[in-house]
Interface confidence: medium
């Protein structure tokens, strides 16, 4: 069962899945100037049996300019750098969910993929939140949200996470410089598409933060 909505947005925070439940779909999106090959998959699907899970289908991109070739251009160094880390490298990282049965790891990048990944999550998926660079969490413990099914509807639990600017301790958090304003992450009320671009770029920077950066909702 697909989750109807995106995980909750938290001011000055981004989220990431450590691993993906079977049934999760990842759109095969190509960067500007490239397109999916004609016979290529629309999405990758996390599938598996009792002992092993993996991504079915492969995403392939080809240049939009050359119609009859599947020649793939090697990404430039800065593009490779942007994709370098797809998991939180923080020492506060939760248990590796990918070691659990029924979960797939982050799929490796494919050549000329779009700069943002769009996932379709399923019930039971857990995502973890982290404050963006320059902000620290005022809670401790894993900041997680889980997609749950209640009365036939899906919902994400609300993580109890506050991110505040470290330089500003005499006033309420949120009044600091708007560099990490959540406006940069528009969300659709009806879409179940989830993007992780911001997270992939920012976790490299945020991984060096010393403070505990996660917390959780209790119910």
């Amino acid at each position: 069962e697909l989750c109807d909505d995106d995980p909750p947005e938290i001011p000055h925070a981004t989220f990431k899945a450590m691993a993906y439940k079977e049934g999760t779909m990842l759109n095969c999106e190509c960067k500007r100037g490239f397109r999916r090959i004609k016979s290529g998959s629309l999405y990758m699907l996390c599938t598996g049996n009792s002992s092993h899970s993996s991504w079915d289908n492969q995403c392939q991109c080809t240049s939009s300019a050359t119609r009859n070739t599947t020649k793939q251009v090697t990404p430039q160094p800065e593009e490779q750098k942007e994709r370098k880390t797809t998991e939180m490298q923080s020492p506060m990282q939760p248990v590796d969910q990918a070691s659990l049965p029924g979960h797939c790891r982050e799929p490796p990048p494919w050549e000329n993929e779009a700069t943002e990944r769009i996932y379709h999550f399923v019930v039971g998926q857990m995502v973890y939140y982290q404050c963006v660079q320059g902000y620290r969490a005022l809670h401790r413990g894993p900041a997680e949200s889980v997609c749950k099914m209640t009365h036939g509807k899906t919902r994400w639990t609300q993580p109890q996470l506050i991110c505040t600017g470290e330089m500003e301790t005499s006033q309420f958090p949120g009044e600091e410089k708007p560099q990490a304003s959540p406006e940069g992450r528009p969300e659709s009320e009806t879409s179940c598409l989830v993007t992780t671009t911001d997270f992939q770029i920012q976790t490299e920077m945020a991984a060096t933060m010393e403070t505990s950066i996660f917390t959780t909702e209790y119910q």
Partner: antibody, heavy 116, light 107 residues
Framework: EVQLVESGGGLVQPGRSMKLSCAAS????????MAWVRQAPKKGLQWVAY????????YYRDSVKGRFTISRDNARSTLFLQMDSLRSEDTATYYC?????????WGQGVMVTVSS | DIQMTQSPSFLSASVGDRVTINCKAS??????LNWYQQKLGEAPRRLIY???SLQTGIPSRFSGSGSGTDYTLTISSLQPEDVATYFC?????????FGGGTKLELK
């Protein structure tokens, strides 16, 4: 089950002090930011003070800055609000709340009346 | 501070009615908006978080919508137990601020 129980309210004269306490149970208190919210009679709600899980970061609304002090005792799972130089406009019901993104759980509140 | 303006401030409706309460922010709050219900003599309780996510245990007749500066709480079919004061609250920017409240009563 999460429980937040406030105490220490009552009638106090302007300029005097009062200390509120909030006993927490049913959740890992030392992992969570906490806050005090107040509601004047027949009025809306106002965030008053906020404290990080470890007590290292505290925040106050402008009107109480320098007069109120929020603190916590994680060993006793208790939140405090020390209110000095009280004014008549501080008269309100004071609620203890888990910080969260909005105040996920609330106590039943304690009434503070500042009057001569 | 971000100002939150609720309308109407008072509302009278009949059981079974569809009720809508509006909340306008003085600036974009990026869907970081919650709705609370406060019954007489009780503490507020959160109904909706993040504009449209229903809090656990809250009946599905409550729903939220909106974006930018304009938000709405809808009760699809009013029940007697819904008599209360309703508050919106933004958590986009500190200090978090509440609307002035909408008092809902039965006709």
């Amino acid at each position: 089950e999460v429980q937040l129980v406030e105490s220490g309210g009552g009638l106090v004269q302007p300029g005097r002090s009062m200390k509120l306490s909030c006993a927490a149970s049913g959740f890992p208190f030392s992992d969570h930011a906490m806050a005090w919210v107040r509601q004047a009679p027949k009025k809306g709600l106002q965030w008053v003070a906020y404290i990080s899980y470890d007590g290292d970061n505290t925040y106050y609304r402008d009107s109480v800055k320098g007069r109120f002090t929020i603190s916590r005792d994680n060993a006793r799972s208790t939140l405090f609000l020390q209110m000095d130089s009280l004014r008549s406009e501080d008269t309100a019901t004071y609620y203890c709340t888990t910080g969260g993104n909005s105040g996920y759980d609330w106590g039943q509140g304690v009434m503070v009346t500042v009057s001569s | 501070d971000i100002q939150m303006t609720q309308s109407p401030s008072f509302l009278s409706a009949s059981v079974g009615d569809r009720v809508t309460i509006n909340c306008k922010a003085s600036q974009n709050v990026n869907k970081f908006l919650n709705w609370y219900q406060q019954k007489l003599g009780e503490a507020p309780r959160r109904l909706i978080y993040g504009t449209n996510s229903l809090q656990t245990g809250i009946p599905s007749r409550f729903s939220g919508s909106g974006s930018g500066t304009d938000y709405t709480l809808t009760i699809s079919s009013l029940q007697p137990e819904d008599v209360a004061t309703y508050f919106c609250q933004q958590y986009s920017s500190w200090p978090w601020t509440f609307g002035g409240g909408t008092k809902l009563e039965l006709k």
